[in-house]
């Protein structure tokens, strides 16, 4: 089996207030089975941004159709950016577990920061 890697190509993403930000994440393998989640920050206080399998995230859309059985693109778009959205975003692969899924591998993270306002 090819070892799964989480690829977040941008280390830094400069965004503009009010605009939409695209955070890229691709995986190199579909295995082990389990969901991909997005978080802002690390550790126990990290904020869940998007959960592939459940939840309501009105400002978040996926770039690809995650219902494709061979989908490896878990990039997301966050609309209506505000200063409160700055931080480092991680896409994280979980493997299935009982009763809870188990964190398997994290991407290196993408820092979202505010860029200069357009003149």
């Amino acid at each position: 089996e090819e070892e799964l890697q989480m690829i977040q190509p941008e280390k830094l993403l400069l965004v503009t207030v009010g605009k939409t930000a695209t955070l890229h994440c691709t995986v190199t393998s579909l295995l082990p089975v389990g969901p991909v989640l997005w978080f802002r920050g690390v550790g126990p206080g990290r904020e869940l941004i998007y959960n592939q399998k459940e939840g309501h995230f009105p400002r978040v859309t996926t770039v690809s159709d995650l219902t494709k059985r061979n989908n490896m693109d878990f990039s997301i778009r966050i609309s209506s950016i505000t200063p409160a959205d700055v931080g480092t975003y991680y896409c994280v692969k979980f493997r299935k577990g009982s009763p809870e899924n188990v964190e398997f591998k994290s991407g290196p993270g993408t820092e979202m920061a505010l860029g200069a306002k357009p003149s």
Partner: antibody, heavy 118, light 107 residues
Framework: DVQLVESGGGVVRPGESLRLSCAAS????????MSWVRQAPGKGLEWLAG????????YYIDSVKGRFTISRDNPKNSLYLQMSSLTAEDTAVYYC???????????WGLGTLVTVSS | ALTQPASVSANPGETVKITCSGG??????YAWYQQKSPGSAPVTVI????KRPSDIPSRFSGSASGSAATLIITGVRVEDEAVYYC???????????FGAGTTLTVL
């Protein structure tokens, strides 16, 4: 309430074609992958085909590849199964099912009976 | 292929366990589907190994480990008589499969 209602079943002769429909309501149809599953008389469940939410990707069991085509019309909240070159072995109740995020099934239709007989 | 026993029986109130083997824990998610009569609509009682839909009684539970999944009915009732199908999705092949079904008889 999620509701899936199949239609289009009936009696056909070997070699003929049939198109099944599944009308979906009670959920955002365009957000879910869908599948067709059948059950021959006295037999178990058999998955036939699946389709992604957007309709661009389709998946089939080997035994129906080339004969059956799954498709969907999201504005009409409808799923279809076009079946051709039917044989007696295709006689079954055909169910449409909504997929979970990991391609299992959470809701099923009541089924429509297809009988292939000369 | 997924393998499950052809039949199990129990008295009301007992705990029933139905096993399903043949999948790979690394690549397979399991579900359990209840069919009360042939040709009637199946009902999903467990999906994603151990997730119970909100309208399914709490006496139904599921687990998976290694190459097997288990459906557990704690305090079985007469109305639980049905055929239970184990289902799997294999992320390696993109294919759904079913076991042959287990007939549960409540004595």
């Amino acid at each position: 309430d999620v509701q899936l209602v199949e239609s289009g079943g009936g009696v056909v002769r070997p070699g003929e074609s049939l198109r099944l429909s599944c009308a979906a309501s009670g959920f955002t149809f365009s957000s879910y992958a869908m599948s067709w599953v059948r059950q021959a008389p006295g037999k178990g469940l058999e998955w036939l085909a699946g389709i992604s939410a957007g309709g661009s990707d389709t998946y089939y069991i080997d035994s129906v590849k080339g004969r059956f085509t799954i498709s969907r019309d999201n504005p009409k909240n409808s799923l279809y199964l076009q079946m051709s070159s039917l044989t007696a072995e295709d006689t079954a109740v055909y169910y449409c099912a909504r997929e979970t995020w990991n391609h299992l099934f959470d809701y099923w239709g009541l089924g429509t009976l297809v009988t292939v007989s000369s | 292929a997924l393998t499950q026993p052809a039949s199990v029986s129990a008295n009301p109130g007992e705990t029933v366990k139905i096993t399903c083997s043949g999948g790979d824990y690394y690549s397979t998610y399991y579900a359990w589907y209840q069919q009360k009569s042939p040709g009637s609509a199946p009902v999903t009682v467990i999906h994603s190994d151990d997730k119970r839909p909100s309208d399914i009684p709490s006496r139904f539970s599921g687990s998976a480990s290694g190459s097997a999944a288990t459906l557990i009915i704690t305090g079985v009732r007469v109305e639980d008589e049905a055929v239970y199908y184990c289902g799997g999705y294999d992320g390696r092949t993109y294919i759904n499969t079913f076991g042959a079904g287990t007939t549960l008889t409540v004595l």
